[in-house]
Amino acid sequence: TPTTLASHSTKTDASSTHHSSVPPLTSSNHSTSPQLSTGVSFFFLSFHISNLQFNSSLEDPSTDYYQELQRDISEMFLQIYKQGGFLGLSNIKFRPGSVVVQLTLAFREGTINVHDVETQFNQYKTEAASRYNLTISDVSVSDVPFPFSAQSGAGVPG
């Protein structure tokens, strides 16, 4: 299983904030030096950006609005989870409700738990407001049980 911790979710309310045009998502801990084989822990994260308006552009990955917001959020998570275990995010999507962001975070197995994912994200809210002009609230984090490192059995592991 992706994590040894019990699967649970946490939810908090608070504010913090969007926008900049930064080149996307590479940092020193996101370096391209080869890494050892390891398991991966996945965490589902949902939050509101209350100072942005949802429109149909956020349903289309080819639009500038979608790509700029994804780039900002990707860069933001690199800043939040600077420790070596953060791999990146996955399957980001945007929903109505100002803008609701839903995504999956990937970490090297054993480097973080669901509580710390949420705590570190909440601690970054003020900086998110000043650096990216993103007002963040309604944060929810949960484990995603998925046997990423299991390679035996009758399935067809890729």
Epitope: P23, P24, L25, T26, H30, S31, T32, S33, P34, Q35, V40, F42, F43, F44, S46, P61, Q67, Q70, S74, L87, G88, S90, N91, K93, R95, Q102, T104, A106, S142, V144, P145, F146, P147, F148, G155, V156, P157, G158
Partner: antibody, heavy 118, light 107 residues
């Protein structure tokens, strides 16, 4: 332990609708963040991502095929379905499903070969 | 859609050779690139994700590197069992796209 198996008609004629089923075990599509993608590969050629369905029934499609694709799921039966309308010979391929908690694919089904032939 | 241009298409090799495959993205994808191996009649197998992370059980002769638009996949010492087709994939944004493949062949 994750397993996946695709099934389809094998052979169908041009202009017909292709219906594919992905049956899986080892994960649940009711889990937040989970999803399943369909990917296809014409014989001897490259891979083409087709569609993705999320746990909450949100859907994504390849823009080049969007008007012909329809993805759906039956969470309780651990199945995901893909329909492709108005098929022609260019749709002849092996069709794979893969779970997508990540946007890369550590697990694939064995694939099902679909041949479109008059 | 992001185009992944993969080269070369064919790569003649001998056992023990060091081989390199490159993939170039039509726009920046950060380090969101995966590499797969596919043998005839089999499904693709994940080797590398996030540009440089080896999947569980993948031998350390397989490595990946790169960021932004330019990515490299290397086999440090080719073994007979490595003869296969290799694909890159950008997993940054929908629609996920793959390179056209590189086939390793006996020299």
């Amino acid at each position: 332990q994750i397993t996946l198996k695709e099934s389809g008609p094998g052979i169908l004629q041009p202009s017909q609708t292709l219906s594919l089923t992905c049956s899986f075990s080892g994960f649940s599509l009711s889990t937040s963040g989970m999803g399943v993608s369909w990917i296809r590969q014409p014989s001897g050629k490259g891979l083409e991502w087709l569609s993705h369905i999320y746990w909450d029934d949100d859907k994504r499609y390849n823009p080049s095929l969007k008007s012909r694709l329809s993805i759906s799921k039956d969470t309780s039966r651990n199945q995901v379905f893909l329909k492709i309308t108005s098929v022609d010979t260019a749709d002849t391929a092996t069709y794979y499903c893969a779970p997508g908690v990540s946007s890369w694919f550590p697990y694939w089904g064995p694939g099902t070969l679909v041949t479109v032939s008059a | 859609s992001i185009v992944m241009t993969q080269t070369p298409k064919f790569l003649p090799v001998s056992a023990g050779d060091r081989v390199t495959v490159t993939c170039k993205a039509s726009q920046s994808v950060g380090n969101y690139v995966a590499w797969y191996q596919q043998k005839p009649g089999q499904s693709p197998k994940l080797l590398i994700y996030f540009a440089s992370n080896r999947y569980s059980g993948v031998p350390d002769r397989f490595t990946g590197s790169g960021s932004g638009t330019d990515f490299t996949f290397t086999i440090s010492s080719v073994q007979v069992e490595d003869l296969a087709v290799y694909f890159c994939q950008q997993h940054y944004i929908f629609p996920y796209t793959f390179g056209s493949g590189t086939k390793l062949e006996i020299k």
